[in-house]
């Protein structure tokens, strides 16, 4: 019962996490104009991984895609790559984990196969979450560096008269979505790995042979000497595995993922 719950919860948490990673990757607000001393602005700039946008006071918003690959900063390319790798791994992980779910019966799939698939998807979720967290963190670091650089030369005076105010950028909503989503995917992956341990069938026991002095026919008794021989002594696993109370129709319903704004 606990294994199914852990596996199911891990799947749902990862699903929400990956949906969040996809949302963060698509969002335009990775960096937003810093309104350091002017909370109300007539022109508001914000940037994403794929395009930069400008919102005017009237509400009119204009976005321009980055139509160049070579002209983009290497760091931005790296962040894009990390996020895409995270999404791809997460998507594959989700696909694998669907078939690995204890509550879903597919043909005569053995528990050992389901355990392996659960572990595989768990590892994929962990790597996916780490990729997202790394991508967002690299971008955040890039922002912090640029922020202080632009603060240092905030006003570049031309003859001391004309001022060119440099636009400073700060953390956008997508960074927080990415961090949270990456963390959820990571947690979901860990839960899947934990569930895998519970799903793994017991080690193969040697079939104990009972010898009788009378020379009667040999009786094979599976697990007969378990307590005394030390074979298959993983009682913890046995307890969970032989719980018996677990049914195939114990499918829990989980809340659906809500899109941001």
């Amino acid at each position: 019962m606990a294994v199914t719950a852990c596996q199911g919860l891990g799947f749902v948490v990862s699903l929400i996490g990956i949906a969040g990673i996809i949302a963060a990757t698509c969002m335009d607000q990775w960096s937003t104009q810093d309104l350091y001393n002017n909370p109300v602005t007539a022109v508001f700039n914000y940037q994403g991984l794929w395009r930069s946008c400008v919102r005017e006071s009237s509400g009119f918003t204009e976005c321009r895609g980055y139509f160049t690959l070579l002209g983009l900063p290497a760091m931005l390319q790296a962040v894009r790559a990390l996020m895409i790798v995270g999404i791809v791994l997460g998507a594959i992980g989700l696909l694998v984990s669907i078939f690995a779910l204890k509550c879903i019966r597919i043909g005569s799939m053995e528990d050992s196969a389901k355990a392996n698939m659960t572990l595989t998807s768990g590892i994929m979720f962990i790597v996916s979450g780490l990729c997202a967290i790394a991508g967002v963190s690299v971008f955040a670091n890039m922002l912090v560096t640029n922020f202080w650089m632009s603060t240092a030369n905030m006003y570049t005076g031309m003859g001391g008269m004309v001022q060119t105010v440099q636009t400073r950028y700060t953390f956008g909503a997508a960074l927080f979505v990415g961090w949270v989503a990456g963390g959820l995917t990571l947690i979901g992956g860990v839960m899947m790995c934990i569930a895998c341990r519970g799903l793994a069938p017991e080690e193969t026991n040697y079939k104990a042979v009972s010898y009788h002095a009378s020379g009667h026919s040999v009786a094979y008794k599976p697990g007969g000497f378990k307590a005394s021989t030390g074979f298959g002594s993983n009682t913890k696993n046995k307890k969970i595995y032989d719980g018996g109370a677990r049914t195939e129709d114990e499918v829990q319903s989980y809340p659906s993922k809500h899109d941001y704004v």
Epitope: N38, A42, N45, V54, S58, F60
Partner: antibody, heavy 120, light 113 residues
Framework: QVQLVQSGAEVKKPGASVKVSCKTS????????MLWVRQAPGQGLEWMGN????????TYALKFKGRVTMTVDRSTSTVYMELSSLRSEDTAVYYC?????????????WGQGTLVTVSS | DIVMTQSPYSLAVSLGERATINCKSS????????????LAWYQQKPGQPPKLLIY???TRESGVPDRFTGSGSGTDFTLTISSLQAEDVAVYYC?????????FGQGTKVEIK
């Protein structure tokens, strides 16, 4: 066609308040930001603030903050600008103008203006 | 606040001649996010409200004759009337549309010589 029709001229005493209306027609009222600009006799133009008719959100020039209040009546597609604690230097023609959505924050339509005279 | 300075204060030009008005801002009106300049030009005739001529420093408003041309970027802008007509006699204002508070130039009066 787009029209912005303002209320008539007003004569006020110093310390009093004035409320100027601007009735709009010919376009979707809540889709465009409305601005107020004033012009003292023989002087240049001075931006006072603006209001988003959809949310009722306002942005005021620091110079007028605390003295100016901009409101909207969506049922009649009318914008109001109230200026309190009037002084003689507030004597001016007050214009309402529409922010031309996608026109880089420029004002594409203007009211005919309302002359407010502050005199004791 | 951004200070807008127009020059000259007044301008007398013969009919059919070119009139050039300059506008200088104390801060750049260029927005790097969309590579646009946030400057507008208005024409005001006596007893009338201002009329939008140019927005985004160089884009002509619909219905405005093509003899009106806006140019410039950053802090220096120009309004050119290629061939002055009698109906162009007015006061011309430039406006900072980049940052609050919106500010206007003091105006340039164009007359016929």
């Amino acid at each position: 066609q787009v029209q912005l029709v303002q209320s008539g001229a007003e004569v006020k005493k110093p310390g009093a308040s004035v409320k100027v209306s601007c009735k709009t027609s010919g376009y979707s009222f809540t889709d465009y930001l409305m601005l107020w600009v004033r012009q003292a006799p023989g002087q240049g133009l001075e931006w006072m603030g603006n209001i988003n008719p959809y949310y009722g959100r306002t942005t005021y020039a620091l110079k007028f903050k605390g003295r100016v209040t901009m409101t909207v009546d969506r049922s009649t597609s009318t914008v109001y600008m109230e200026l309190s604690s009037l002084r003689s230097e507030d004597t001016a023609v007050y214009y309402c103008a529409r922010d031309g959505y996608s026109l880089r924050n420029a004002m594409d339509y203007w009211g005919q203006g309302t002359l407010v005279t502050v005199s004791s | 606040d951004i200070v807008m300075t127009q020059s000259p204060y007044s301008l007398a030009v013969s009919l059919g001649e070119r009139a050039t008005i300059n506008c200088k801002s104390s801060q750049s009106l260029f927005n790097s996010g969309n590579q646009k300049n946030y400057l507008a030009w208005y024409q005001q005739k006596p007893g009338q409200p201002p009329k939008l001529l140019i927005y985004g420093a160089s884009t002509r408003e619909s219905g405005v004759p093509d003899r009106f041309t806006g140019s410039g970027s950053g802090t220096d802008f120009t309004l050119t009337i290629s061939s002055l007509q009698a109906e162009d006699v007015a006061v011309y204002y430039c406006q900072n549309a980049h940052s609050y508070p919106y500010t206007f130039g003091q105006g340039t009066k164009v007359e016929i010589k």
